[in-house]
Interface confidence: medium
Amino acid sequence: EVEKTACPSGKKAREIDESLIFYKKWELEACVDAALLATQMDRVNAIPFTYEQLDVLKHKLDELYPQGYPESVIQHLGYLFLKMSPEDIRKWNVTSLETLKALLEVNKGHEMSPQVATLIDRFVKGRGQLDKDTLDTLTAFYPGYLCSLSPEELSSVPPSSIWAVRPQDLDTCDPRQLDVLYPKARLAFQNMNGSEYFVKIQSFLGGAPTEDLKALSQQNVSMDLATFMKLRTDAVLPLTVAEVQKLLGPHVEGLKAEERHRPVRDWILRQRQDDLDTLGLGLQG
């Protein structure tokens, strides 16, 4: 808590400018009007304040807005955002995507902090669902964002938002998450032609059921081994040798390199040796 002291004569701030960097903490507290600070927040980031000075500015805003900052202030917080606690952020009502982008930019290149997680949570809850623009923004800043959501949270993602998802956004998703995302992707891409559909759906196939894999095997898709290895074991097991051969196409040779790993290992054990022999790869059931 900064002690209340009178502002020295002639030091009352008329605007937020670089002269304030020479103010001691108590002078900032005494000489900067909170309302002036709120209206000129966009200037704060251009001024090289110390962390201690930023603490004072935050304190002034907290006094002015005890119920939480208005969005006009939040949008221009800049580096002052890093001083906010999750408790501070829970008081906010952030509705503008521009505000979200501005604050994510401040944290760019760092792991998702508790502050950022709280901000995103407040924003998404305020919108009611993860729309395409929001998902676009969040995955641009945090490629792993989608996979950080629970299956329950993912269920609120509308199929239209799936268009924003890039393959790398799904790298850390587990099978339960892909189980939720795959039907949405299937719906989102349903009107695409065969080859384009496969390119888009490929990253989501870890949630595909057996019948969809069987259907893909009839379409000459040449699935690569990395994608095949991410398929659900229970979805792969019922596939016949002929179906796997058609599904993988030229990549079928890769089964030999992966024969000790799931789901290939488990699938091999389910096949008749005579059928495996037809692959010509020397796989042993």
Partner: antibody, heavy 115, light 110 residues
């Protein structure tokens, strides 16, 4: 020991034809894919064509589609590349390579297309 | 068609240096990515397949990794015999099977 030996390269005029051979030993090409990859003088690698005899798969790079044909004679354990309508830009060392990750390569054979 | 953009095109390094070469795919790409070493007048040699699997007989100082559409070859401690040209290569999945090579990176002695 796995070995691949290319032959059939040489000097040919634009519009002419040439057939390259890739004799394999140490494995059965019937059960493996075979690729042709070329390298123009001082340039990088360019994939040309692929065959997987067991499944009768053949694939080609757009730059050679309709002019080159890849084939295999499994009784001779040899893959071939029939090159027709040759152009100056086809001048390169042609390598054959084996398998899923191109794990074995031949020493290469030089094809020069010039008048 | 998918392009594999390899960088840098050349680099100078000393024995013992850590060297990193990157290939960026122009679009969503499978992990069927391999790395090769080629010395003048010789055929390429396989180093890494499936993005990160070390080929048998290849020294453990070579490693491969993937992050999204970026694929990286790392030589942890450069040896005299490692001065060569390195290529990345991708085998596409999808309807049109094709193989694409990066432009190559020449690793020279500083």
């Amino acid at each position: 020991e796995v070995q691949l030996v290319e032959s059939g390269g040489g000097l040919v005029q634009p519009g002419g034809s040439l057939r390259l051979s890739c004799a394999a030993s140490g494995f059965n090409i019937y059960y493996s894919s075979m690729h042709w990859v070329r390298q123009a003088p001082g340039k990088g690698l360019e994939w040309v064509a692929y065959i997987y005899p067991y499944y009768s798969y053949t694939y080609y790079a757009d730059s050679v589609k309709g002019r080159f044909t890849i084939s295999a004679d499994t009784s001779k354990n040899t893959a071939y590349l029939q090159m027709n309508s040759l152009r100056a830009e086809d001048t390169a060392v042609y390598y054959c390579a084996r398998g899923y990750a191109l794990d074995y390569w031949g020493q290469g054979t030089l094809v020069t297309v010039s008048s | 068609d998918i392009q594999m953009t390899q960088s840098p095109s050349s680099l100078s390094a000393s024995v013992g240096d850590r060297v990193t070469i990157t290939c960026r795919a122009s679009q969503s790409v499978s992990s069927a990515v391999a790395w090769y070493q080629q010395k003048p007048g010789k055929a390429p040699k396989l180093l890494i397949y499936s993005a990160s699997s070390l080929y048998s007989g290849v020294p453990s100082r070579f490693s491969g990794s993937r992050s999204g559409t970026d694929f990286t070859l790392t030589i942890s401690s450069l040896q005299p015999e490692d001065f060569a040209t390195y290529y990345c290569q991708q085998a596409s999945s999808g309807y049109h099977y094709l193989i694409t090579f990066g432009q190559g990176t020449k690793v020279e002695i500083k």
